[in-house]
């Protein structure tokens, strides 16, 4: 099966790489604009230059194109704890990230929030905090992992999953009580 091509892809595929078909005259292939620029006017004829203009401040194009307008620069979402890693240039969008000792949690494909990396109190670091993943903790004896925090087994209710993790501790306590001197 041949994949369905959109009108723009169909038009572009007629021309060699780096060129696009003139929208008013399909016998003319115009050179695409470099990244950092946009299409101001199509080339007037074969072998003639396409009129490309540089993107204005606050906009960009990251690849060769024949866009009539540059794309607006993204803004980092301060309300989600995001900070600017690198500012927008004519050929590259803003790069947003998190502060040191924080990680990104993606709520959806293009929306992330910054959270502090877990410190693994009452446990040890099993896997260090990474750009897109919180620290993975292993808890000390007498503690169990709940939502990536080491919680005392004294907070373990019988109905919860922690009973399995805290059972050895409970048995140890029993054992200590049973092994009293006569």
């Amino acid at each position: 099966l041949v994949p369905h091509l959109g009108d723009r892809e169909k038009r572009d595929s007629v021309c060699p790489q780096g060129k696009y078909i003139h929208p008013q005259n399909n016998s003319i292939c115009c050179t695409k604009c470099h990244k950092g620029t946009y299409l101001y006017n199509d080339c007037p004829g074969p072998g003639q230059d396409t009129d490309c203009r540089e993107c204005e401040s606050g906009s960009f194009t990251a690849s060769e194109n024949h866009l009539r307008h540059c794309l607006s620069c993204s803004k980092c979402r301060k309300e989600m704890g995001q900070v600017e890693i690198s500012s927008c240039t004519v050929d590259r969008d803003t790069v947003c990230g998190c502060r040191k000792n924080q990680y990104r949690h993606y709520w959806s494909e293009n929306l992330f929030q910054c959270f502090n990396c877990s410190l693994c109190l009452n446990g040890t670091v099993h896997l260090s905090c990474q750009e897109k993943q919180n620290t993975v903790c292993t808890c000390h004896a007498g503690f169990f992992l709940r939502e990536n925090e080491c919680v005392s087994c004294s907070n373990c209710k019988k109905s919860l999953e922690c009973t399995k993790l805290c059972l050895p501790q409970i048995e140890n306590v029993k054992g200590t009580e049973d092994s009293g001197t006569t």
């Epitope: 979402r77 301060k78 309300e79 949690h105 929030q113 959270f115 502090n116 939502e147 990536n148």
Partner: nanobody, 119 residues
Framework: EVQLLESGGGLVQPGGSLRLSCAAS????????MIWVRQAPGKGLEWVSY????????YYADSVKGRFTISRDNSKNTLYLQMNSLRAEDTAVYYC????????????WGQGTLVTVSS
């Protein structure tokens, strides 16, 4: 005790409108970014929109951009979602929540309000 009570859902025809409300209590409403999420039948949670504490910064999922408008009234501790040009794919249970701060989990949910878009 934190409480979030959604209302305003119902059956509407494609192209129609609805306005959802979320009455909040038990926390300092005007200190939190508030969000709307939805869950379509048999699907996972999808972020719809959020609004910052002052009502100046908003976010919309691409699927609702230009059709839905989020707003809030801090004097009434109420969050709103105006839904226009509704489509069948907007059918879902809509929930409001406060944006978590310490960890990526929602500690409090309302019961949700069902929006059904059908002719």
């Amino acid at each position: 005790e934190v409480q979030l009570l959604e209302s305003g859902g119902g059956l509407v025809q494609p192209g129609g409108s609805l306005r959802l409300s979320c009455a909040a209590s038990g926390f300092t409403f005007n200190a939190y970014t508030m969000i709307w999420v939805r869950q379509a039948p048999g699907k996972g949670l999808e972020w719809v929109s959020y609004i910052d504490p002052h009502g100046t910064i908003t976010y919309y999922a691409d699927s609702v951009k230009g059709r839905f408008t989020i707003s809030r009234d801090n004097s009434k501790n109420t969050l709103y979602l105006q839904m226009n040009s509704l489509r069948a794919e907007d059918t879902a249970v809509y929930y409001c929540a406060k944006l978590p701060r310490a960890a990526p989990r929602f500690d409090y949910w309302g019961q949700g309000t069902l929006v059904t878009v059908s002719s």
